[in-house]
């Protein structure tokens, strides 16, 4: 059993290495930024990410592309719930430094938990998305 788990971990690691989780990150950032825009946040505030959604994208245009590609990537983990959880954790960790404030972090986490379901996939049951402060970019 232990050896099987070790092989499973190794397989998950290599799956994660080949996955492109950036579209998922973009898709989620677009979602929470669109929500914030409707509450009066400045949609033209600068971003460090070269592919962060433009104000044009944030109103919904272009976002289906990120979602489609994101779902394709998550679909690769469908047979391995633990690995799917690791992918979600990686997304959380990669974006944690870009999230401004507790509220945005909670919103991102909520959207992230819904992501597999949004893609028509099974969501991992127990998946801890807490990030230690000063989350590093494992990508």
């Amino acid at each position: 059993r232990q050896q099987w788990e070790l092989q499973g971990d190794r397989r998950c690691q290599s799956q994660l290495e080949r996955a492109n989780l950036r579209p998922c990150e973009q898709h989620l950032m677009q979602k929470i930024q669109r929500d914030e825009d409707s509450y009066g946040r400045d949609p033209y505030s600068p971003s460090q990410d070269p592919y962060s959604p433009s104000p044009y994208d944030r109103r919904g245009a272009g976002s289906s592309q990120h979602q489609e590609r994101c779902c394709n990537e998550l679909n690769e983990f469908e047979n391995n719930q633990r690995c799917m959880c690791e992918a979600l954790q990686q997304i959380m960790e990669n974006q944690s430094d870009r999230l401004q404030g507790r509220q945005q972090e909670q919103q991102f986490k909520r959207e992230l938990r819904n992501l597999p379901q949004q893609c028509g996939l099974r969501a991992p049951q127990r998946c801890d998305l807490e990030v230690e402060s000063g989350g590093r970019d494992r990508y």
Partner: antibody, heavy 123, light 108 residues
Framework: EVQLVESGGGLVQPGGSLRLSCAAS????????MNWVRQAPGKGLEWVSS????????YYADSVKGRFTISRDNAKNSLYLQMNSLRDEDTAVYYC????????????????WGKGTTVTVSS | EIVLTQSPGTLSLSPGERATLSCRAS???????LVWYQQKPGQAPRLLMY???TRATGIPDRFSGSGSGTDFTLTISRLEPEDFAVYYC?????????FGQGTKLEIK
């Protein structure tokens, strides 16, 4: 050397079938999404189909949906395109292309292409 | 389906001149999913630019890409003899992953 080599093209009558193969070498085939792209004589590029690493997501152009089937065998480092109910308008050079992405920023692109195999549908 | 329209269909210029090729999408395309390819007669396409503005490995810096939303541009600052070819834009965000019809860059 990273390489893709297509084979299986030829002359076939309308309504006939053909199976194209693409042999990959010089890279870990199972790590990449793969695509078929075609080009009719004197015309532009037309994306035909794509398949993800573990074959879990497959897409087709509307023009071939229901007639063509893409598949892959990661153990054999091979990509396939089964073409049924062929029409005159399927006459083209068929390219096999590897899809990669920029690890740091995420964009996808087809960075390795085969030389192509010619399919001619004619009576 | 996202339709990509390239213009002009043919561009006749001389070496040393500047070339500006346009790619217009029927609906918004995220920069992340906009790619440019170059194809010479009898050859397979070659990756030129991805993410709308990032040059692929080995592509000289006279090539640059820009644009967002529905309008994208490929610029070649000073044409070299080897740049005369057909150029295609492609979007790979939404299936079907469509190509533009191409712009032929020919020697004047």
């Amino acid at each position: 050397e990273v390489q893709l080599v297509e084979s299986g093209g030829g002359l076939v009558q309308p309504g006939g079938s053909l199976r194209l193969s693409c042999a990959a070498s010089g890279f870990i085939f199972s790590d990449y999404n793969m695509n078929w792209v075609r080009q009719a004589p004197g015309k532009g590029l037309e994306w035909v189909s794509s398949i993800t690493r573990s074959s879990r997501t497959i897409y087709y152009a509307d023009s071939v949906k229901g007639r063509f089937t893409i598949s892959r065998d990661n153990a054999k480092n091979s990509l396939y395109l089964q073409m049924n109910s062929l029409r005159d308008e399927d006459t083209a050079v068929y390219y096999c292309a590897r899809e990669d992405f920029d690890v740091s920023t995420g964009p996808y692109y087809m960075d390795v292409w085969g030389k192509g195999t010619t399919v001619t549908v004619s009576s | 389906e996202i339709v990509l329209t390239q213009s002009p269909g043919t561009l006749s210029l001389s070496p040393g001149e500047r070339a500006t090729l346009s790619c217009r999408a029927s609906q918004s395309v995220s920069n992340m999913f906009l790619v440019w390819y170059q194809q010479k007669p009898g050859q397979a396409p070659r990756l030129l630019m991805y993410g709308a503005s990032t040059r692929a490995t080995g592509i000289p810096d006279r090539f640059s890409g820009s644009g967002s939303g529905t309008d994208f541009t490929l610029t070649i600052s000073r044409l070299e003899p080897e740049d005369f070819a057909v150029y295609y834009c492609q979007q790979n965000g939404n299936s079907p992953y469509t190509f533009g019809q191409g712009t032929k860059l020919e020697i004047k």
